[in-house]
């Protein structure tokens, strides 16, 4: 039975040209996390594997950085970066947990961070 929940940074906004940290956290389970995938819609951005460390997709190498922790830092943001981002936790024995973050990249300087929320 899957008992865990994923807490994320929720709906967030950031300025064009700036950077943002996407963060998820899996709680309420004793399952071992073996890998975390970060995806934007259907594109794989990065993988953090418990044994092998980080792999950043070549097409994002210049704009994506690992961390802090299991989070992901997006740099040099453009309006095209607006959209849904997913953290996919592969765990044993529970299986897969997915968290969703919506990022809006704004032209102006009125970017605000949303509150955290939980996805069961």
């Amino acid at each position: 039975m899957m008992t865990g929940t994923i807490e994320t940074t929720g709906n967030i906004s950031a300025e064009k040209g700036g950077s943002i940290i996407l963060q998820c956290h899996l709680s309420s389970t004793t399952a071992q996390v073996t890998q975390v995938n970060w995806e934007q819609q259907d594109q794989l951005l990065a993988i953090c594997n418990a044994d092998l460390g980080w792999h950043i997709s070549p097409s994002f190498k210049d704009r994506v950085a690992p961390g802090p922790g299991l989070g992901l830092t997006l740099q040099s943001l453009t309006v095209n970066d607006t959209g849904e981002y997913f953290c996919i936790y592969h765990t044993y024995p529970d299986g897969t947990y997915t968290g969703r973050i919506f990022l809006e990249v704004l032209e102006s300087s009125v970017a605000e961070h949303g509150a955290r929320f939980q996805i069961p």
Partner: antibody, heavy 117, light 106 residues
């Protein structure tokens, strides 16, 4: 088995700068963040920042921005930290540590820096 | 930045005794890491992600907590457990460490 070998102790003059190294072996250097941590007897552990050798990205603790500079040479799997404008406050042991998402799992043996006036 | 307060600063325990030390954060954090350091050596990852034991750590150690309150517990103290234990958070930049709890053998 991952291993981090740090450079030897340094005795440096106040106002000068120092550059220490951290040579990584036993793992893929470009797949892990490399952190630097300062330890002083009275102040405990202070996180300085990290570098991701895969693309050179750095993330600094604001308190050390301008004081420390982190670099990495992927050809030799070596990370470096330079500390400038040294004062007695910079006398400490500096550790490098590997981190791949699940806390800092391997640490170097530390480099002792003593600043003399 | 988030400040982590560890208590007690120093404690002593007899072999076989249960030991609990705490780490309190000024703001809520999603998880906590713990490191063990013995005099003259580098810190070692001990407990990560609040409750997961690092490789080689004896099963008598456990970690728990949520929000602003976390703890490390040793079910039965052994001589080799005498060391300083540091908590660390990275829910918020910059990462911060507690000042440490020094555990001595009575």
């Amino acid at each position: 088995q991952a291993y981090l070998q740090q450079s030897g102790a340094e005795l440096v003059r106040s106002g000068a700068s120092v550059k220490m190294s951290c040579k990584a072996s036993g793992y893929t250097f470009t797949s892990y963040n490399l952190h630097w941590v300062k330890q002083t007897p009275g102040q405990g552990l202070k996180w300085i920042g990290y570098i991701y050798p895969g693309n050179g990205y750095t993330n600094y603790n604001q308190k050390f921005k301008g004081k420390a500079t982190l670099t990495a040479d992927t050809s030799s799997s070596t990370a470096y930290m330079q500390i400038n404008s040294l004062t007695s406050e910079d006398s400490a042991v500096y550790f490098c540590a590997r981190e791949g998402g699940w806390a800092m799992d391997y640490w170097g043996q530390g480099t002792s820096v003593t600043v003399s006036s | 930045q988030i400040v982590l307060t560890q208590s007690p600063a120093i404690m002593s325990a007899s072999p076989g005794e249960k030991v609990t030390m705490t780490c309190s954060a000024t703001s809520s954090v999603s998880s906590m890491h713990w490191y063990q350091q013995k005099s003259g050596t580098s810190p070692k990852r001990w407990i990560y992600d609040t409750s997961k034991l690092a490789s080689g750590v004896p099963g008598r150690f456990s970690g728990s907590g949520s929000g602003t309150s976390y703890s490390l517990t040793i079910s039965s103290m052994e001589a080799e457990d005498a060391a300083t234990y540091y908590c660390q958070q990275w829910s918020s930049n910059p990462s911060t460490f507690g000042a440490g709890t020094k555990l001595e053998l009575k």
